[in-house]
Interface confidence: low
Amino acid sequence: SERCDDWGLDTMRQIQVFEDEPARIKCPLFEHFLKFNYSTAHSAGLTLIWYWTRQDRDLEEPINFRLPENRISKEKDVLWFRPTLLNDTGNYTCMLRNTTYCSKVAFPLEVVQKDSCFNSPMKLPVHKLYIEYGIQRITCPNVDGYFPSSVKPTITWYMGCYKIQNFNNVIPEGMNLSFLIALISNNGNYTCVVTYPENGRTFHLTRTLTVKVVGSPKNAVPPVIHSPNDHVVYEKEPGEELLIPCTVYFSFLMDSRNEVWWTIDGKKPDDITIDVTINESISHSRTEDETRTQILSIKKVTSEDLKRSYVCHARSAKGEVAKAAKVKQKVPAPRYTVELACGFGAT
């Protein structure tokens, strides 16, 4: 067969869907690989073909679109399951072609089971809410395109296993769930179940997401360097080990890249000939404020090393700070000769 532009298996889009629920899967070619959309391709006489490879099989086979009640169908660039079955799991390929052009991509589809409390192997999206920040909402995700706007579904919200009703600060409002004032106690998994009718059948869509309550931007500050500071002097003799911790507190900031680094005489440690190692550790508070510690270590410090400038730098979206460590060479204690007889005793 003639050559086909094969984009391979697109593992970036590991699609997971629940068993016994409708699923609509768009061919990724038009979303991520080609510069034109399905309508343009269709008007140009290109045909979209679907096939799949079952789990633990190597054989590509056509998708059976003649199942009872049109359980699997294709509409434009969307593959529909109404509903899915466990053994629909596999790698699906969509191929766009005519006599002179061919392009295809495969993607994995995993049909997963859930228990009565909505626990499953599904990877959950995380929605962050700011602590004590006023009314914030989450929206039932990925339900667009399943039913027309004329259909009014029923939506039930759950926290963990429990239906949300008469909760103090959490109010279901259709597709939205409103948090009047988010607190740490609101951390957890929230599930919306959308129920809608179609052609005399009732379908359910289950969507679970994790809510994480994080530090509010109202309280955010630039990075704070706790160490080094003016109260601690790193006084060493040549040959001793020099250990200087740089400990920095970062307020939680959405999408901020927190950075800590050392410079030695204005250069990065890697560009200095001395044998220096840097070890980093990171810890988080319950609201995802971050404390980063980078320990600069020189195993056997020289008198030259003790004259260098050691500066800890930190940066977040709130600003950049730097602090020099106070490093000095230990002065040997003066040696006193004590003559015990001098001025004491009998004459």
Epitope: R257, E259, W261, W262, K268, D270, E280, Q294, H313, R315
Partner: antibody, heavy 124, light 107 residues
């Protein structure tokens, strides 16, 4: 001294694959993000891909997404670019460049060390 | 994605002239901008990073300025060895886009 040396370029037919390499020496390779940049004959520089020091993050320019894969072997001090489904427009000199120093973020992000480049020609 | 637009695309100046190349980002990039020099048949060479920090070993006739969206590279007194193509590049986040280049020649 600090050095990057690319290899593996050559002439390849459209639709075929090629893997190019970049050997690093003279610095702590495992501490740096690394990049691939390309330059088509007579054209400007085009950034292609980045990989963080520990492979935890990779990103590609749109024109190669899904076709090219950047990887590294820190034990061998080597950066790779696997190029699949090659097209005529991928013809270029491919350079590897040293990126940010781990722990510093963007402070040292500028591409301070470059290799001499390896030529990849896609032609039938 | 953020676009980087350089101007002019080429220029011709006499030895000793002051040369100014501009680079504009389609969105603000703070000071995450680098300038490179590329001589024919050679790999690019970093001149300036963080918009205005001169890389060690680069002659002081090169300088950079700007922040946000508008940046300039200035060669205070053009020398014959400065004949090259100059590129700006943003590096605040991927994709790390380059400008289209400015070719500098001697009159």
């Amino acid at each position: 001294q600090v050095q990057l040396v690319e290899s593996g370029g050559g002439v390849v037919q459209p639709g075929r694959s090629l893997r190019i390499s970049c050997a690093a020496s003279g610095f702590t390779f495992r501490s740096y993000g690394m990049h691939w940049v390309r330059q088509a004959p007579g054209k400007g520089l085009e950034w292609v891909a980045i990989i963080w020091h520990d492979e935890s993050y990779k990103y590609y320019v749109d024109s190669v997404k899904g076709r090219f894969t950047i990887s590294r072997d820190n034990s061998k001090n080597t950066l790779y670019l696997q190029m699949n489904s090659l097209r005529a427009e991928d013809t270029a000199v491919y350079y590897c460049a040293r990126g940010d120093y781990y722990g510093s973020g963007s402070y040292y992000d500028a591409f301070d060390i470059w290799g001499q480049g390896t030529m990849v020609t896609v032609s039938s | 994605d953020i676009q980087m637009t350089q101007s002019p695309s080429s220029l011709s100046a006499s030895v000793g002239d002051r040369v100014i190349i501009t680079c504009r980002a389609s969105q603000g990039i703070s000071n995450y901008l680098a300038w490179f020099q590329q001589k024919p048949g050679k790999c690019p060479n970093l001149l300036i990073y963080a918009a205005s920090t001169l890389r060690s070993g680069v002659p002081s006739r090169f300088s950079g300025s700007g922040s946000g969206t508008d940046f300039t590279l200035t060669i205070s007194s053009l020398q014959p060895e400065d004949v090259a193509t100059y590129y700006c590049q943003k590096y605040n986040s991927a994709p790390y886009t380059f400008g289209q280049g400015t070719k500098v020649e001697i009159k």
